[in-house]
Structure formats: structure tokens, C-alpha cells
């Protein structure tokens, strides 16, 4: 099939005191090969500070996956979800606390 770029969505949720978990989800993409990782101050975080979901079919002939990391509250703006798919990339910041969703269809 032809390339279908991911829809990328960043959310935040309360973790322990002083920390939040930020999750970056990529969905509705094809082919299944994708890079999804958190960056801090422009540089990718180490593998052991992130948790990844499997790349799974979403039932429409496309795929979905996610990556999450725990960060200090107040430091959100230093973090960006980096997505790379089929030679294209995009970056997705963490929304401020009063809004929990950032949907971006990468072209």
C-alpha cells in the first residue's frame, strides 16, 4: 500500500508527587516501521528512561504505537516527542496543564 503518515497525539497525566507521565501516541500509519522517542533539550532520551508499546495493527490496515516517559512537573517544555516515518519527521511538544491533547496529522 501507499504511505500513510501517522496521527500523533501527546497527553499528560499525573504520576507521583512532583512528576507527570507524558505519553506520545502515533496511530493510523503505514508502513509499520516508525521511530517514536522523547527528546529533552533537543536530544533523544536514553532507552531505559522510556517505555514503548508494541507496534500493533489498528484494524484499518494501518498501525499504532506509543512511547511514554516520566518527567518533573514544570519541566514539560524541555521535552518533545520526535516521530520519524518514511523519511519524514515531526516534533510534538507537551501541552500545558489546562489542555490535554495535541493532535497533529503529519504530512
Amino acid at each position: 500500500g501507499s504511505t500513510v503518515p501517522p496521527m500523533v497525539n501527546v497527553t499528560r497525566s499525573e504520576a507521583s508527587e512532583g512528576n507527570i507521565t507524558v505519553t506520545c501516541r502515533a496511530s493510523s500509519f503505514y508502513p509499520r516501521n516508525i521511530i517514536l522517542t522523547w527528546r529533552q533539550d533537543g536530544v533523544s532520551l536514553s532507552h531505559d528512561t522510556q517505555q514503548w508499546g508494541d507496534v500493533l495493527p489498528d484494524g484499518n490496515g494501518t498501525y499504532q504505537t506509543w512511547v511514554a516517559t516520566r518527567i518533573c512537573r514544570g519541566e514539560e517544555q524541555r521535552f518533545t516527542c520526535y516521530m520519524e516515518h518514511s523519511g519524514n519527521h515531526s516534533t510534538h511538544p507537551v501541552p500545558s496543564g489546562n489542555s490535554h491533547h495535541h493532535h497533529h496529522h503529519h504530512h
Epitope: 533537543g42 517544555q77 519527521h89 516534533t91 511538544p93
Partner: antibody, heavy 117, light 107 residues
């Protein structure tokens, strides 16, 4: 010290192409995205696109997607912007910049591209 | 695309004056806003990022504030070296967009 040094001024005819270089030093080139921005004479700033020098993956402003090509050479720590099918309105100063998370912290000195018949 | 409307387009002020420049985004940019100073023939210099964080080496007379769609750059006491053009830029989503600039001139 982080430095981005760009190639010199260019004069091109309409319909031609131009390739501007941006040589990085003072940091790990493949760790950070390189962004490209232009500024027409007396005008504001316009984002062209970005490249991951480590992988070569790109992100283009839709306005430039058909005419701009971003590349990077890891062996020389150099990023390139090639703009094709030049027209007079492409006359501008072209800047490269480093993306530090969620802002541009260091900029090249700029390259003036003049398109004139 | 998010449009950035900057005002005023120019202003005349004297050394020692307090100067305020505003930038309004067409949508919520979650404080992902930077301010730059540019002098003729030079590249932009980062002053403020994340709406209110002063970049290294920037004098404390500069300050940024705002959230959501409305942002402000303030120079508390204008100095001779501050006469320049100032731009805002949003980093919430690509294409990253800039305000049209504010030229600060000597009265």
C-alpha cells in the same frame, strides 16, 4: 562554542537552483535538528523546514515542499538547503538554526540569495 | 497554520523608557513562544523562550510573559543597544510561524 557557518552570497537567474550550506561545529551534529528560515528584504521570517542530520529525515513547510530539498553530510557536519525553480520573490537571506528542544538557540550568519535576470 | 500577529509594527522611544511589544497567536500555543532581537545585517538573537525564560547572557531588563494566545515582551528601561527589530515565533506546531516584527527606533 556552538557555531553555524553558512556559505557565501549567491546570484542566480530565474528558473535556476541554488544550494546553501551550513557547517556546524562545537556540538554533536547528529544529535540536533537543523532548521532553515528565510527573510526577504525588509520582511519577516519564514520557516522552510528541518532535517535530522543523523537520519536524513525531513519536515517541510508545505509552501516549500515541491522546491526545497534538505540534506546533511555527517562526515563534514554540514547541512544543505537546495531551492529549485527560483523566482524573483525567492530573493532573501537564508538562515540555518539549531533546534534545541522547542526553540532555535543558535543561528548561522545568513546567506543572501539574489534572483535576478 | 497558526498566525502570529505582532504589535505595534514600529515604535519610537527614548533611552530609559519602558517598552512593551505584544504577540497574539490565532490559536493556543501553550507558551511555546520565543522572542528574538535582530539588528540590520545580522541573524536573529534569542532573547526569551518558553514565553518567559531568559536566554543565557540576556540582560534582566528584558522579560517575557503570557499564556494561551497572548504574549508580551517588555524592556523595562530601554538602552541604546536595544534599538533593533523584535520578532516572536511560535513552536507549538509546524509550520513554525513568526510575527511580522516590531522596529524599535530612537525618538
Amino acid at each position: 562554542e556552538v557555531q553555524l557557518v553558512q556559505s557565501g552570497a549567491e546570484v542566480k537567474k530565474p528558473g535556476a537552483s541554488v544550494k546553501v550550506s551550513c557547517k556546524a561545529s562545537g556540538y554533536a551534529f547528529t544529535n540536533y535538528l537543523i532548521e532553515w528560515v528565510r527573510q526577504a528584504p525588509g520582511q519577516g521570517l519564514e520557516w522552510i523546514g528541518a532535517i535530522n542530520p543523523g537520519s536524513g529525515a525531513t519536515n517541510y513547510n508545505e509552501k516549500f515542499k515541491d522546491r526545497a530539498t534538505l540534506t546533511a553530510d555527517k562526515s563534514t557536519n554540514t547541512a544543505y538547503l537546495e531551492l529549485s525553480s527560483l523566482r524573483s520573490e525567492d530573493t532573501a537571506v537564508y538562515f540555518c538554526a539549531r533546534f534545541l528542544g522547542n526553540y532555535f538557540d543558535n543561528w548561522g550568519q545568513g546567506t543572501l540569495v539574489t534572483v535576478s535576470s | 497554520d497558526i498566525q502570529m500577529t505582532q504589535s505595534p509594527s514600529s515604535l519610537s522611544a527614548s533611552v530609559g523608557d519602558r517598552v512593551t511589544i505584544t504577540c497574539r497567536a490565532s490559536g493556543n500555543i501553550h507558551s511555546y513562544l520565543a522572542w528574538y532581537q535582530q539588528k540590520p545585517g545580522k541573524s536573529p538573537k534569542l532573547l526569551v523562550y518558553y514565553a518567559e525564560t531568559l536566554a543565557d547572557g540576556v540582560p534582566s531588563r528584558f522579560s517575557g510573559s503570557g499564556s494561551g494566545t497572548d504574549y508580551t515582551l517588555t524592556i523595562s528601561s530601554l538602552q541604546p543597544e536595544d534599538f533593533a527589530t523584535y520578532f516572536c515565533q511560535q513552536f507549538w506546531t509546524t509550520p513554525y510561524t513568526f510575527g511580522q516584527g516590531t522596529k524599535v527606533e530612537i525618538k
